[in-house]
């Protein structure tokens, strides 16, 4: 497949509500407008698929209803949000972009965004 450059931030800290957002930007060398974006999680040398969506450039991303991801697109940028994260979900989240159609097919894989998730401290019992 033809290589395509994908850029994403090195580090992101999830919010106290377990939400992390980052931008995945790809340098589209072809004319393809049917694009597939996949978020992969790498931890302990294991790679698992977190979520994926195919969209037409200019459209919003539509993830499956039960997906923990949401996203918007603008030109060659995809703004990804991952929800429901807990401390155990800390890891390297890799953005993979494929230009699916029309040909030629292009594949780009980012270096990954290290997402740190800190579980909030439980609220102490109140005497009031």
């Amino acid at each position: 497949c033809k290589a395509m450059h994908v850029a994403q931030p090195a580090v992101v800290l999830a919010s106290s509500r377990g939400i992390a957002s980052f931008v995945c930007e790809y340098a589209s060398p072809g004319k393809a407008t049917e694009v597939r974006v996949t978020v992969l999680r790498q931890a302990d040398s294991q790679v698992t698929e977190v979520c994926a969506a195919t969209y037409m450039m200019g459209n919003e991303l539509t993830f499956l209803d039960d997906s923990i991801c949401t996203g918007t697109s603008s030109g060659n940028q995809v703004n990804l949000t991952i929800q429901g994260l807990r401390a155990m979900d800390t890891g390297l989240y890799i953005c993979k972009v494929e230009l699916m159609y029309p040909p030629p097919y292009y594949l780009g894989i980012g270096n990954g965004t290290q997402i740190y998730v800190i579980d909030p401290e439980p609220c102490p019992d109140s005497d009031f």
């Epitope: 497949c1 049917e34 037409m56 699916m100 159609y101 029309p102 040909p103 030629p104 594949l107």
Partner: antibody, heavy 120, light 111 residues
């Protein structure tokens, strides 16, 4: 569940034209190109062309330029194909198809086909 | 356009045996390490069903007895062990470039 529901069979006279439809459901219609294929009886498949449902941009196999016209109606998630100046050579089953999530899977989901018979 | 030549045109095999269908492309369908060759199964009165994509990857819900191999210009579809339900037409298809093209088809029957 992705579904492509095509219109029913057509019996048309030589020289006439026909318009068939392909109603999409189970996915966002504007996120995938719609492709059209022709399969003559007992033969292989020929790619007619594709349309981008987002903006209506089309691209045709040179062989079908001037024969086929592809359109979409975003409001009803329906793609259509118009065939003109029909001859017996145009008698065939016509399919609409959508791509999948694997690389190069341009025809992962298919309509059931529309049979067009050209006869006087 | 890339021309795909399938062989044999028809094939009969015993249940439980291996059936092999070949597809030769007029030029390479490889691009940077990926072979853009797909295989379809078609039964009478039905649309084609995607069996194998990118030469060797199984389509969704496709039984493990279907496998694909090859690169460049020469590809094959293997079915083992053959089952009654495998009686059908089989087509190869390249998706390296537009226009996508299909092979002439192979009719597979049970002996």
């Amino acid at each position: 569940e992705v579904q492509l529901q095509q219109s029913g069979p057509e019996l048309v006279k030589p020289g006439a034209s026909v318009k068939m439809s392909c109603k999409a459901s189970g996915y966002t219609f504007t996120d995938y190109y719609m492709k059209w294929m022709k399969q003559s009886h007992g033969k292989s498949l020929e790619w007619i062309g594709h349309i981008n449902p987002n903006n209506g941009d089309t691209f045709y196999n040179q062989k079908f330029t001037g024969k086929a016209t592809l359109t979409v109606d975003k409001s009803s998630s329906t793609a259509s194909m118009h065939l003109n100046s029909l001859t017996s050579e145009d008698s065939a089953v016509y399919y609409c198809a959508r791509g999948g999530d694997g690389r190069g899977t341009w025809f992962a989901y298919w309509g059931q086909g529309t049979l067009v018979t050209v006869s006087s | 356009d890339i021309v795909l030549t399938q062989s044999p045109a028809s094939l009969a095999e015993f249940l439980g045996q291996r059936a092999t269908i070949s597809c030769r492309a007029s030029e390479s369908v490889d691009s940077y390490g990926i072979s853009f060759m797909n295989w379809f199964q078609q039964k009478p009165g039905q649309p084609p069903k995607l069996l194998i994509y990118a030469a060797s990857n199984q389509g969704s819900g496709v039984p493990a007895r279907f496998s694909g191999s090859g690169s460049g210009t020469d590809f094959s579809l293997n079915i083992h062990p053959m089952e009654e339900d495998d009686t059908a037409m089989y087509f190869c298809q390249q998706s390296k470039e537009v226009p996508p093209t299909f092979g002439g088809g192979t009719k597979l029957e049970i002996k």
